[in-house]
């Protein structure tokens, strides 16, 4: 009897996640089963299902399968956290590259190699043909998507909408071309799921056909997702266990990224005297940790055994016993020669002088003409002439082309926060350069701070639902979760963007974070119908010293009665003193028996000078800060509230005027709170939203 193949390897797993259909017309099928493997087999074969199965959820508590004709990218569907659920999505429907001839390709590309729109498979116009969806069941001849139903050479193709061109292949890259790695691929987190000989990889969370020790729960930082190729043990390149019982493991064919391909694990800039960023490029000779204990040699296993050897980490310069950062830690570190202290950070190495010698700018740097051509994160600037189209998209005047020479840092758009440049990296289209304002330069970047010259509110009215102003709606409030635990607040300012504080991110691994929207209770108790759980796809750090972060969501939030956005104030505006405002959060309340519900504290705006007096003159506020005091003594933000908003109302419009950041204690009587002034950073926020790509809903 032929053994039925295990098809769960063809699915991408998202743990503790389910899909909720917002569109009631969408069908779903359920059945009691014992394992997720059974769900997968039925989904793959579409056996007894009245639709083409694209994904399923396995309910571990009820031992039940839920099969779906949609996936998380479909419209009318939302992802939701659920401890007992695991979501599995057929990779063929979410993959944007092809394997081999692309017979299994089921993506949504619908344009041919020369740019002609494809003809729908069910249509006979302009070309008659015999490739009917009904004749090619299982080949997914849907819409006008490129397909290769017969597995022909050349890959996926389609009939074209041009009567002159009957059919043409589509330009869909091979997965092996799309995927690339740096060094020996220990930081590779791509989606290659087959070996160089074409064998399908075994899932890391499975022990058949090969038993192994690399359990995802045991090594949460190794990226053991689904059955993707990884390099957890310092091999020459990524590999995987295979589904072939006779081949335990095999390397994967992943090419080395071209020099100009940057990802967050590439060494941005080599330094020897100081550290830039996280110090991954530090190549100096400091060889003690912060408290003077000498480092252990990287090629030694005494007194501490480890796998951070020069052989395993070829590009990381693990020479002698010098401090290094081979694994994306906070800063350079080493194993120590003290048997009782395994590792220590070399935090005594200074940060690189951000001002690069005499290089500095005055005002906002619009007249800066230096020749620095590198961003603060170490990316090389790209040429201005290649980016003029993008520049025109967000400025409404003709930039001075004579200033925009080569790839030097400049400020053609009058950015309040100094010179910047485009990077050529699609994830970080542009960033500021590490240049400081010249010492002694007091030119304000915003004038008339304490006089209400510019109104904060835009002239539009408050959103109205069913004829009632939603003044009590706090749908913009976000609970940022770190390893499922509430750590900070945040404000939804656009469907894909949350404004929060930089102190809210202890870990660099974005998989550790989620944004919960539409909730009132910190644990989502009773909020199941309105809660949206979204992954975080990127953090964009605010201008130097701002403490702000724009957190990009992996997909846009669905705006509804429970989730809404909050407005930003006009750039540089001033809100009048004594304006009544509120801070919101799930932070520490000082109550012995806190119920976990969102709290509000009412504050009023205080001028910067008066605020400084209340702080006994120990604090001088600048143009990037805003001050608000409590109406009720001892109320104000605390741990767990950071990142959340200071919300004020002007002309019947509510806006986020401040962001809560760790400051000078929680709710100290007669000490007003100091917040990051959003109006000062409003242009930066708009510029990020305008220039950074976000996933489409």
């Amino acid at each position: 009897q032929r053994k039925r193949r295990n098809t769960i390897h063809e699915f991408k797993k998202s743990a503790k996640t389910t899909l909720i259909k917002i569109d009631p017309a969408l069908k779903i099928k359920t059945k009691k089963v014992n394992t997720a493997d059974q769900c997968a087999n039925r989904c793959t074969r579409n056996k007894g299902l009245p639709f083409t199965c694209k994904a399923f959820v396995f309910d571990k508590a009820r031992k039940q399968c839920l099969w779906f004709p949609f996936n998380s990218m479909s419209s009318g569907v939302k992802k939701e956290f659920g401890h007992e659920f695991d979501l599995y999505e057929n990779k063929d429907y979410i993959r944007n590259c092809i394997i081999g001839k692309g017979r299994s390709y089921k993506g949504t590309v619908s344009i041919t190699k020369s740019g002609i729109k494809c003809q729908p498979w069910s249509s006979m116009i302009p070309h008659e043909h015999s490739f009917l969806p009904s004749s090619y069941r299982g080949k997914d001849l849907q819409e006008n998507y490129c397909r290769n139903p017969r597995g022909e050479e050349g890959g996926p193709w389609c009939f074209t909408s041009n009567p002159e061109v009957r059919y043409e292949v589509c330009d869909i890259p091979q997965c092996s071309e799309v995927e690339c790695m740096t060094c020996n691929g220990e930081s590779y987190r791509g989606l290659m799921d087959h070996t160089e000989s074409g064998k399908i990889c075994q899932r890391w969370d499975h022990q058949t056909p090969h038993r192994h020790k690399f359990l995802p729960e045991r090594y949460p930082d190794k990226g053991f997702d689904d059955n993707y190729c990884r390099n957890p043990d310092g091999q020459p390149r990524p590999w995987c266990y295979t589904l072939d019982p006779h081949t335990r493991w095999e390397y994967c064919a992943i090419k080395t990224c071209a020099d100009n391909t940057m990802n967050d694990t590439d060494v941005p800039l080599e330094t020897t005297e100081c550290i830039q960023g996280q110090g991954e490029g530090y190549r100096g000779t400091v060889n003690t940790i912060w408290n003077g204990i000498p480092c252990q040699r990287w090629d030694s296993q005494y007194p501490h055994e480890h796998d951070m050897t020069p052989e395993n980490f070829k590009c990381k310069d693990l020479r002698e016993n010098y401090c290094r950062n081979p694994d994306g830690s906070e800063s350079p570190w080493c194993f120590t020669t003290d048997p009782n202290i395994r590792v220590g950070y070399c935090s005594q190495i200074p940060n690189c002088d951000m001002s690069h010698g005499q290089d500095c700018y005055r005002g906002n740097g619009k007249n800066y003409m230096g020749n620095l051509s590198q961003t603060r994160s170490g990316l090389t600037c790209s040429m201005w002439d290649k980016n003029m189209e993008d520049l025109h998209r967000h400025i409404f005047w003709e930039p001075d082309a004579s200033k925009l020479n080569e790839n030097y840092c400049r400020n053609p758009d009058d950015d309040a926060h100094g010179p910047w440049c485009y990077t050529g990296n699609p994830l970080i289209p542009w960033d500021y350069c590490p240049i400081s304002r010249c010492e002694g330069d007091t030119t304000p970047t915003i004038v008339n701070l304490d006089h209400p010259v510019i109104s904060c509110a835009k002239t539009k009215q408050l959103r109205v639902v069913n004829g009632i102003p939603t003044r009590t709606n706090i749908g913009w409030m976000v609970s940022l979760r770190y390893r499922n635990k509430h750590i900070c607040g945040g404000s939804l300012i656009k469907e894909s963007w949350v404004l929060t504080a930089r102190q809210c991110f202890p870990s660099r691994d974005l998989k550790d974070y989620e944004a919960w929207l539409g909730i009132h209770d910190v644990h989502g108790r009773g909020d199941e119908k309105c809660k949206q759980v979204l992954n975080v796809s990127q953090l964009v750090y605010g201008p130097e010293g701002s403490d702000l972060v724009l957190m990009k969501l992996a997909r846009p939030a669905v705006l509804d009665d429970f989730v809404s956005t909050i407005d930003l104030p006009n750039y540089g505006c001033t809100i009048p003193e004594k304006t009544s405002c509120s801070v919101y959060g799930w932070g520490y309340t000082g109550l012995i028996n806190y119920d976990g519900l969102l709290r509000v504290a009412h504050l009023y705006i205080m001028g910067n000078e008066k605020c400084s007096q209340h702080h006994r003159g120990k604090v001088t506020l600048n143009e990037s800060e805003i001050c608000a005091g409590a109406e009720k003594i001892g109320s104000g933000p605390c741990e767990g509230d950071y990142g959340g908003p200071l919300v004020c109302e002007q002309h019947k419009m509510r806006m986020v005027l401040g962001v809560i950041v760790p400051g000078r204690g929680c709710a100290i009587p007669n000490r007003p709170g100091i917040f990051v002034r959003v109006a000062y950073y409003a242009k930066w926020i708009h510029k990020i939203i305008l220039t950074y790509k976000v996933p489409q809903s």
Epitope: E330, N484, K485, S507, W586, N593, Y594, P662, G665
Partner: antibody, heavy 118, light 107 residues
Framework: EVQLVQSGAEVKKPGESLRISCKGS????????MHWVRQMPGKGLEWMGE????????NYNPSFQGHVTISADKSISTAYLQWSSLKASDTAMYYC???????????WGQGTLVTVSS | DIQMTQSPSSLSASVGDRVTITCKAS??????VSWYQQKPGKAPKLLIY???NRNTGVPSRFSGSGSGTDFTLTISSLQPEDFATYYC?????????FGQGTKLEIK
């Protein structure tokens, strides 16, 4: 009044299993995470892990992961710490502590002394 | 893991003295630091949270300060009941960690 009451002292042999408990009262048990902290004789405090009684979600210290299991039964407001196979080196005082957010571990149990000896 | 290095590991002082205990984190922990007092045979007791906030019922002679990597617990005027072991702890990043303790003894 908030109270965390832990189960009594235990004397066990190596290889045996054990479950100790911590019962919360005087507050909303499911709002707060429950933590377990070890203190070996004459030594300092070591954080073992935490559980959210609402949904059973746990975060462990990698040094303890796989050796202990943290669980909770919200219907009786009790958190548990269990071992499937004790070692002599597990001899210690174990404390539970509640924590809602950040650095605020405001209430602690009285401690459970576990002695493992052959 | 983030190391919390406390100093001194022990100190002798007299009633009425001003005492300072420091705690250095091996990396930035913002202000997610708490201080605990533990007496022999008893559970730890929270004194300070968020680096500088006194817990309810803690006498005003106890104060905390610092942010980032350097933190301080100060007892402005020692009382007989203050002789105990003091621990700092960070809960910014997993795994949460404590300092090794400072034993405060009567001179």
């Amino acid at each position: 009044e908030v109270q965390l009451v832990q189960s009594g002292a235990e004397v066990k042999k190596p290889g045996e299993s054990l479950r100790i408990s911590c019962k919360g009262s005087g507050y909303s048990f499911t709002t707060y995470w429950m933590h377990w902290v070890r203190q070996m004789p004459g030594k300092g405090l070591e954080w073992m892990g935490e559980i959210n009684p609402t949904n059973g979600h746990t975060n462990y210290n990698p040094s303890f992961q796989g050796h202990v299991t943290i669980s909770a039964d919200k219907s009786i407001s009790t958190a548990y710490l269990q071992w499937s196979s004790l070692k002599a080196s597990d001899t210690a005082m174990y404390y539970c502590a509640r924590n809602y957010v950040g650095s605020i571990f405001d209430y602690w149990g009285q401690g459970t002394l576990v002695t493992v000896s052959s | 893991d983030i190391q919390m290095t406390q100093s001194p590991s022990s100190l002798s002082a007299s009633v009425g003295d001003r005492v300072t205990i420091t705690c250095k984190a091996s990396e930035n922990v913002v202000s997610y630091v708490s201080w605990y007092q533990q007496k022999p045979g008893k559970a730890p007791k929270l004194l300070i949270y968020g680096a500088s906030n006194r817990n309810t019922g803690v006498p005003s002679r106890f104060s905390g300060s610092g942010s980032g990597t350097d933190f301080t617990l100060t007892i402005s005027s020692l009382q007989p009941e203050d002789f105990a072991t003091y621990y700092c702890g960070q809960s910014y990043n997993y795994p949460y960690t404590f300092g090794q303790g400072t034993k405060l003894e009567i001179k």
